[in-house]
């Protein structure tokens, strides 16, 4: 589809003769038929397969026509066509006297004719004029023409067609050759498809518009480069949606159970060495001078009252030193220059000589003890508290501090360590002698049944359309990440398909 | 593979409603992905509405609102009720199935919807 343009310039007349030699009265007042038609050889009479176009009276004899509308026709004049311009054609132009006011062929006298040229030739579309110039006895004509297309028509034929647009099927504007031209943002086909950030993942990103980047689930970040953890995942990270992986010293489903509590909780006091014995568990080992549960008391060495016969104890440094009472001598005041006629024997303890009178023991009443039943009994001594207890001295009573895991007067009741469902989903605890044991139910596994070992949900390949599957696993179930074009559970649904799709 | 054929399609004026219906054959109906796509001349065919295979529904941005689509798995049909329907909307309505093992759809012949202003 396109117009044939005729731009009529100059006519002169100078005689104001008629074609056939008669003069016109007053003057020629002249317009013009146009005929377009089909190329031939020799253009000759018939229809005017392109088109016809008349003027009204443009001026008398000789004259210049102007450029836009003259007398209220038009000047270029327009021959439109609806077809594929075929490159050749024919022109006809007449000049014809208007003696009274009816242009009507009919209603002219056959001798009011002018003049006629008619011309032929090949005419390629574009902007550029042709200027001619066409000369008879007694007239000359000039005149310039050009071939365009149509509005949304392009191409050497004005046989394409194609309109801009900017909606939901496209947005693009149309090259010469008729071919789209993407608006900035757009690419493919039809130019439908937003160009998304730059830097936007490929597959885990995506956009309804241009510079947008939108995450599919599982995905977070600028760029939907970040995979999102499991939730509750509280020290780990992930390389793919959904995924735990513990960071070190952490272990559980949700890395939550503290495997290292040593290094984060630095439990143990006074420069003990820490030893993690499972999860939130540990045991310090004391450096000499030190004991409790986290070696956070301080030994005094004469807490074991090793000074005998009535000696007393200081501390020191680098150890002790024991003042021996008059008669005692030795490194614990061991040794006595005493004898029975002494009454060496303190607490209502009786003396017996040894040795011919040279040496004595004394034997004492009950809660009393040492080489002169000179000490209270230390009921520490026969070690009361089991299981790795520590016995203390409160005056006249005793008192046990027990392990972990351990409790009762003497640390003899095992506390049990399934209290606490160390257990994770739904296994079940059994105590042992030296801790616990989880059985686990299907699909986990693991000390504690923090791993889980359930069937892949994304097995069976449940997305369609080279969506990606994930398995979320808190409901093992999948999700689908659906490629740009396509929604559904399943990334079954192509949202739109092109006229052109192969049904 | 299912067999699909519409029905309901017709002339309504603009604000008008009209209910489309496909009916399937095949006893595995109800594990079939089951959507309404539309085709305009000289324009692509668009979805317009589908139930998923979870029973999750999805629906073009521009018929929200006022088109609803709804299965009956004993009687093997999906149905479209479309309201307050624009000249726009004007086009070939197909019936589209999902198989749940190989993703291969399955078209209707299609039924015209004409709405006049």
């Known amino acids: 589809s396109g117009v044939f343009q005729l731009q009529l310039q100059e006519f002169i007349n100078e005689r104001g003769v008629l074609a056939s030699g008669r003069p016109c009265e007053p003057g020629c007042r002249t317009f013009f038929r146009v005929c377009l038609k089909h190329f031939q050889a020799v253009v000759s009479p018939g229809p005017c397969t392109f088109g016809t176009v008349s003027t009204p009276v443009l001026g008398t004899n000789s004259f210049a026509v102007r450029d836009d509308s003259s007398g209220g026709g038009r000047n270029p004049l327009q021959l439109p066509f609806n077809f594929t311009w075929p490159g050749t054609f024919s022109l006809i132009i007449e000049a014809w006297h208007a003696p009274g006011d009816d242009l009507r062929p009919e209603a002219l006298p056959p001798d009011a004719l002018i003049s006629k040229i008619a011309i032929q030739g090949s005419l390629a579309v574009g902007q550029n004029w042709l200027l001619d110039e066409q000369t008879s006895t007694l007239t000359r004509l000039r005149y310039s023409y050009r071939v365009i297309c149509s509005d949304n028509y392009y191409g050497d034929n004005c046989s394409r067609l194609c309109k801009k647009r900017n909606d939901h099927f496209g947005h693009y504007v149309c090259q010469p050759d008729g071919n789209l031209s993407c608006l900035p943002g757009w690419t493919g086909e039809y130019c439908q498809q937003p160009i998304c950030l730059s830097g936007c993942h490929e597959q885990n990103g995506y956009c309804s518009k241009p510079a947008e980047c939108l995450c599919r689930p599982g995905w977070q970040g600028r760029l939907c480069n970040e995979c999102i953890p499991h939730n509750g995942c509280r020290h780990g990270t992930c390389s793919t949606p959904w995924q735990c992986t513990c960071d070190e010293g952490w272990g559980g489903l949700f890395c939550d159970q503290d495997l290292n509590y040593c290094t984060h909780h630095s439990p143990c006091k006074n420069g003990a060495t820490c030893s993690n014995s499972g999860q939130r568990s540990y045991t310090c080992t004391c450096r000499p001078g030190y004991t409790g549960v986290d070696c956070e008391l301080e030994l005094s060495e004469c807490d074991s009252n090793p000074c005998r016969n009535g000696g007393s104890c200081k501390d020191q440094e680098d150890g002790y030193h024991c003042l021996c009472p008059p008669g005692y001598y030795g490194l614990h005041c061991e040794h006595s220059t005493l004898s029975c006629a002494d009454s060496p024997c303190f607490n209502g303890g009786s003396c017996r000589e040894r040795n011919q009178g040279a040496n004595y023991a004394c034997e004492c009443p009950p809660n009393f003890t040492g080489s002169n039943c000179e000490k209270k009994v230390d009921r520490c001594t026969s070690n009361p508290c089991a299981n790795g207890g520590q016995c203390l001295n409160r005056g006249p009573s005793r008192m046990c501090r027990c392990r972990p895991g351990f409790t009762g007067t003497y640390c003899e009741l095992h506390v049990s360590d399934c209290a606490r469902n160390p257990c994770a989903h739904g296994g079940t605890c059994h105590d042992l002698e030296n801790g616990l044991m989880c059985t686990c139910p299907a699909g986990f596994s693991g000390r504690r049944c923090e791993v889980r070992t359930s069937i892949d949900a994304c097995a069976s390949s449940p997305c369609f359309n080279r969506a990606t599957c994930y398995t979320d696993l808190s409901t093992d179930t999948f999700v689908c990440n659906c490629p740009y074009g396509f929604v559904g559970s399943r990334c079954e649904f192509p949202v739109g398909l092109p006229p052109s799709f192969p049904w | 593979e299912v067999q699909l054929v519409e029905s309901g399609g017709g002339l309504v004026q603009a604000e008008g409603s009209l209910r489309l219906s496909c009916a399937a054959s095949g006893s595995t109906f109800s594990t079939y992905a089951m959507a309404w796509y539309r085709q305009a001349p000289g324009k692509q065919r668009e979805l317009v509405a589908g139930i998923s295979f979870d029973g999750s529904t999805h629906y073009a941005e521009s018929v929200k609102g006022r088109f609803t689509i709804s299965r009956d798995d004993a009687k093997n049909t999906v149905s479209l009720q479309m309201n307050s329907l624009k000249p726009e909307d004007a086009a070939v309505y197909y019936c589209?199935?999902?198989?749940?093992?190989?993703?291969?759809?399955?078209w209707g012949q299609g039924t015209q919807v004409t709405v006049s202003s």
């Open positions: 589209y199935s999902v198989h749940p093992s190989t993703g291969f759809g399955s």
